[in-house]
């Protein structure tokens, strides 16, 4: 449906505070480094010129695309070239090749400052002098430092979190009822915005049809009950939500994934039983009780797969007339069979059961040659149950930071050329797995846990492509999406590393680490863990393990010092050496 | 819009040749699969030989099989029908088609479907 001003339609279909709220978020994940009254400034522009449009489609400018108008506006920017350099040449282009250029420079790992939050009565009296102002922030604050962050559950997010601060500021105890919150925002944020980077890079560096693979078989383990047809068509709508997401079309994006809510709700009856409760919220709320609905039932009496995709006369006939749509309902079939699978284990089956029909088809006996096929599946699925298996009893054995260190170890000796801080966020995500999956019975572990490590590893290597160090990291990232885990499992510890030179400044330690949090602690621990492997690669399990403890003790005792300074620096040099002995440094 | 258009039917007696073509356009010609399926007088559809996208998987209906051969230009957006050894129950309208998003496979009628093209083999 063509629209004579599309800034127009988009501002009358989500409302004016939508409208701001999208575009501040586009600005700020485009000009990641801009001040944040610069982009309020620039997105009261937009919603001021989207005005003069509602109220006349046919006003001058009003036809332009919103890439045309959004990017124009960018560029307005004085700064830019002063603070983003290269990214300051995207202007001299043309659209649609502006915004791909603008795309491109979207940084994962942008050079700000941590957030820090305030004191509880400083953060109250800023929401109530100017509550506008006070969740702009917020958006702007997140959009920037997560720029593929999902837009319209942004939205969401900073409900829940206007929410806290309406209710915990007038609470008697306001730190109390609003540090859990703010904390469970925080968590559920990082976790939001790792999902949707994962879905980004599997459009951008995969293309379409790895998406939609990934959806058919996610939406066909959560909606067993629907039909073929209606887990196709869902599929096709949930890709081009993302695929306007991930591009930066944030507004086209919040319209079509409301449109699908509402789509989901009217037909729910041929959808899901589960959706019950999803479809009485309100719009935000709504969208994301659909994304985490619970899998449905699966229906009684399914038939055997192999009557189909292996017994049939038809299977060759059926794979060579549409390979993607056969290829697809084999998919659909084996995933409401399996919600107790991964969702790259099923894609990983597919794409086996693909490689045989694409050799036997072409054979001299076809049914001979794939008839055995469902016996190769056997390894694929048993491979994730058993690293699980191993881990979760690692994890029970160890707890969550002992667990972590672990994966620091093992991570840092497969891969050593990366960086210090990224080695170290990587492996404490990768260890989380365990309090996150190894709690549920064996039939939820597989998909908590396969596909909870996927998005884990996506950040490794988005953190990587910025930077590449590594051949190894390059060559599992980019080779195959569905085989990153098993690729980054596979590598042994890289015998061509050339230990890093020893420095003793990177092992000196100070008496502000006493007062941080039991969290950046474990961090300034895990950041040494790692300098230590990089130096000794080929230290022991026990000699790591006896250098810690040692280094544990030794900020214990300097924390309870008299003058800790001093506790730091003394007995800090008498740890270096007796550590450098104790690893033949 | 899809468009297919078949041509090179026409009469001739048992045990003879004919060679079909099939001209696409309006859709993704290389990455489709095609069909030949065709429809003797008071009969239905009956589905004769499938080519896959890139050419490498050919399957044939019984009744044709070591007589008919399916073959594919894709720089020519065409699919053809090399038919030998004609008899007279393979007199029918021949059509070209390919999958419809959102049919069934192997549900012809619901294929894009060209206008078809008269084989007769009579003596």
């Known amino acids: 449906d063509a629209h004579k001003s599309e800034v127009a339609h988009r501002f009358k279909d989500l409302g004016e505070e939508n409208f701001k709220a999208l575009v501040l978020i586009a600005f700020a994940q485009y000009l990641q480094q801009c001040p944040f009254e610069d982009h309020v400034k620039l997105v009261n522009e937009v919603t001021e010129f989207a005005k003069t449009c509602v109220a006349d489609e046919s006003a001058e400018n009003c036809d332009k695309s919103l890439h045309t108008l959004f990017g124009d506006k960018l560029c307005t920017v004085a700064t830019l070239r002063e603070t983003y350099g290269e990214m300051a040449d995207c202007c001299a282009k043309q659209e649609p090749e502006r915004n791909e250029c603008f795309l491109q420079h979207k940084d994962d790992n942008p050079n700000l400052p941590r957030l820090v939050r305030p004191e509880v009565d400083v953060m109250c009296t800023a929401f109530h002098d100017n509550e506008e102002t006070f969740l702009k922030k917020y958006l702007y604050e997140i959009a920037r430092r997560h720029p593929y962050f999902y837009a319209p559950e942004l939205l969401f997010f900073a409900k829940r979190y206007k929410a806290a601060f309406t209710e915990c500021c007038q609470a008697a105890d306001k730190a109390a009822c609003l540090l859990p919150k703010l904390d469970e925002l925080r968590d559920e944020g990082k976790a939001s915005s790792a999902k949707q980077r994962l879905k980004c890079a599997s459009l951008q560096k995969f293309g379409e049809r790895a998406f939609k693979a990934w959806a058919v078989a996610r939406l066909s383990q959560r909606f067993p009950k629907a039909e073929f047809a209606e887990v196709s068509k869902l599929v096709t709508d949930l890709t081009k939500v993302h695929t306007e997401c991930c591009h930066g079309d944030l507004l086209e994006c919040a319209d079509d994934r409301a449109d699908l809510a509402k789509y989901i709700c009217e037909n729910q009856d041929s959808i899901s039983s589960k959706l019950k409760e999803c479809c009485e919220k309100p719009l935000l709320e709504k969208s994301h009780c659909i994304a985490e609905v619970e899998n449905d039932e699966m229906p009684a009496d399914l038939p055997s797969l192999a009557a189909d995709f292996v017994e049939s006369k038809d299977v060759c006939k059926n794979y060579a007339e549409a390979k993607d749509v056969f290829l697809g309902m084999f998919l659909y079939e084996y995933a409401r069979r399996h919600p107790d699978y991964s969702v790259v284990l099923l894609l990983r089956l597919a794409k086996t059961y693909e490689t045989t029909l694409e050799k036997c088809c072409a054979a001299a006996d076809p049914h001979e040659c794939y008839a055995k096929v469902f016996d190769e599946f056997k390894p694929l699925v048993e491979e994730p149950q058993n690293l699980i298996k191993q881990n979760c009893e690692l994890f029970e054995q160890l707890g969550e930071y002992k667990f972590q260190n672990a994966l620091l170890v093992r991570y840092t000796k497969k891969v050593p050329q990366v960086s210090t801080p990224t080695l170290v966020e990587v492996s404490r995500n990768l260890g989380k797995v365990g309090s996150k999956c190894c709690k549920h019975p064996e039939a939820k572990r597989m998909p908590c846990a396969e596909d909870y490590l996927s998005v884990v590893l996506n950040q490794l290597c988005v953190l990587h492509e910025k930077t590449p160090v590594s051949d190894r990291v390059t060559k599992c990232c980019t080779e195959s999406l569905v085989n990153r885990r098993p690729c980054f499992s596979a590598l042994e510890v890289d015998e061509t590393y050339v230990p890093k030179e020893f420095n003793a400044e990177t092992f000196t330690f100070h008496a502000d680490i006493c007062t941080l949090s039991e969290k950046e602690r474990q961090i300034k621990k895990q950041t040494a863990l790692v300098e230590l492997v990089k130096h000794k690669p080929k230290a022991t399990k026990e000699q790591l393990k006896a250098v810690m403890d040692d280094f544990a003790a030794f900020v214990e005792k300097c924390c309870k010092a008299d003058d800790k300074e001093t506790c730091f620096a003394e007995e800090g040099k008498k740890l270096v050496a007796a550590s450098q002995a104790a690893l033949g440094l | 819009e899809v468009q297919l258009l078949e041509s090179g039917g026409g009469k001739v007696q048992p045990g003879g040749s004919l060679r079909l073509s099939c001209a696409a356009s309006g859709f993704t010609f290389s990455t489709s699969g095609m069909v030949w399926v065709r429809q003797a007088p008071g009969k239905g559809l009956e589905w004769v030989s499938t080519?896959?996208?890139?050419?490498?998987?050919?399957v044939y209906a019984e009744s044709v099989k070591g007589r008919f051969t399916i073959s594919r230009d894709n720089a020519k957006n065409t699919v053809y029908l090399q038919m030998n050894s004609l008899r007279a129950e393979d007199t029918a309208v021949y059509y070209c088609a390919t999958y419809r998003a959102g049919s069934r496979i192997g549900s012809y009628e619901d294929y894009y479907r060209g206008q078809g093209t008269l084989v007769t083999v009579e003596p």
């Open positions: 080519i896959s996208d890139d050419a490498r998987i050919t």
